[in-house]
Interface confidence: low
């Protein structure tokens, strides 16, 4: 009857990048299925991923409603073939997730250099503003819209002929740097939220882009 042979989920883990947020857990089900519930700490539980045989559940739609809220999730285990109408009153085993605050904890996705333009001894480097699934007034917001000045970019640049790197920072999506005339430079950017004190304060570096390739434009 009820949940006799089901086991509770474990290793509940939030995987979140640029607010795309998935809850993962173990074990791979054998003769059981899962239902996930998510809640803000002051709200009601909402069920998602009903009776799934997966060990992950995309909760993005819930967390983007308020990325500064703190969320909890729990994963219930049911026997395979379970339907609500079976009339079982037995509590299914469940496990709670760690708490998750998207604004503080979502990982920053790898940024992309959109373009760079050289004018004399100046180069303007533009970072592509990534779109997120966070909405305001039915409009999707960019990473910059969400984080505002909390988000900065660090530019690493170096002469193609040398390994010595220089850095620049901006709290917009553009850099204006000085370069030596006649030299080719390579660029890589990293997204950073300086106010974070955890491992997720920086993104991975963008792919390297070098002058003399298609993204660049040169004007005297």
């Amino acid at each position: 009857s009820g949940t006799t042979n089901t086991v509770a989920a474990y290793n509940l883990t939030w995987k979140s990048t640029n607010f795309k947020t998935i809850l993962e857990w173990e074990p791979k089900p054998i003769n059981q299925v899962y239902t996930v519930q998510i809640s803000t700490k002051s709200g009601d539980w909402k069920s998602k991923c009903f009776y799934t045989a997966d060990t992950e559940c995309d909760l993005t739609d819930e967390i983007v409603k308020d990325v500064k809220q703190t969320y909890l999730a729990r994963v219930f285990s049911y026997p395979a073939g379970h339907v609500e109408s079976t009339g079982s009153t037995e509590e299914p085993p469940y496990e709670n997730s760690p708490e998750f605050t998207p604004y503080l904890e979502t990982n920053l996705g790898q940024p992309t250099i959109q373009s760079f333009e050289q004018v004399g001894t100046k180069v303007n480097v533009t970072v592509q503003d990534e779109w997120t699934l966070v909405r305001r007034n039915d409009t999707f917001l960019s990473l910059r819209d969400v984080f505002g000045k909390d988000l900065i970019y660090t530019l690493y640049y170096w002469k193609s002929s040398s390994s010595g790197k220089k850095t620049a920072k901006t709290n917009t999506n553009e850099f204006l740097i000085d370069v030596d005339k006649g030299e080719n430079y390579c660029f890589s950017v990293q997204a950073v939220i300086p106010s974070r004190r955890t491992a997720n304060r920086k993104s991975t570096d963008s792919p390297v882009e070098c002058m003399g390739h298609e993204k660049g434009e040169s004007r005297e």
Epitope: S39, E91, N96, T198
Partner: antibody
Amino acid sequence: QVQVVESGGGLVKPGGSLRLSCAASGFSISSYDMSWIRQAPGKGLEWIGIIGSNGRTYYADSVKGRFTISRNTNENTVYLQMNSLRAEDTAVYYCARGLYDGTGNIWGQGTLVTVSS
Amino acid sequence: ELVMTQSPPTLSLSPGERVTLSCRASQSVYGNNWLSWYQQKPGQAPRLLIYGASKLATSIPARFSGSGSGTQFTLTISSLQPEDFAVYYCQGTYYSGDWYFAFGQGTKVEIK
């Protein structure tokens, strides 16, 4: 074997400081919420504070500003730094894993802290 | 802040009797069910009996059961055994921008 072991208790003068340690084995503290609870002689249990699996800390009003919980995930150890100690802080101090709703709940045997001149 | 109130403070009973302990929260515990019961014997650390208001912890005998929701909770021992004489604590969880955890003052179950 999954267990937690507290250490660092002893006699300290009022106004003094003490750091308690909670060494965990058989599991990773970075995956669990770890709490400190105390029990004064002949009294009930009192929750002191918690460090979440994400490293966030919360404290009881009675110790806010005086006590600090931290952790070293490499050493798999949780700490309770106690400053400005008072006589009423005399108690057995317990470290426990998983207090949110009891799942995965494990308690140590406690360490006695005596605050007296 | 969350305050947990247990009643009665002391119960004098004989083995075999049915025991009902009460715990009241000053406001609804988180999720209406984040309420645990612990047993503590002299010189020992507390031992978890019930979590989630009604779920039996690992290796706890089935004579222990929990019920309730929101602010009112009950621990029942269907038939008191000699090893059950101890102090019982309820512990609730509350959230209001910060987490709060609070224990009741305890109910001592002693031999009559």
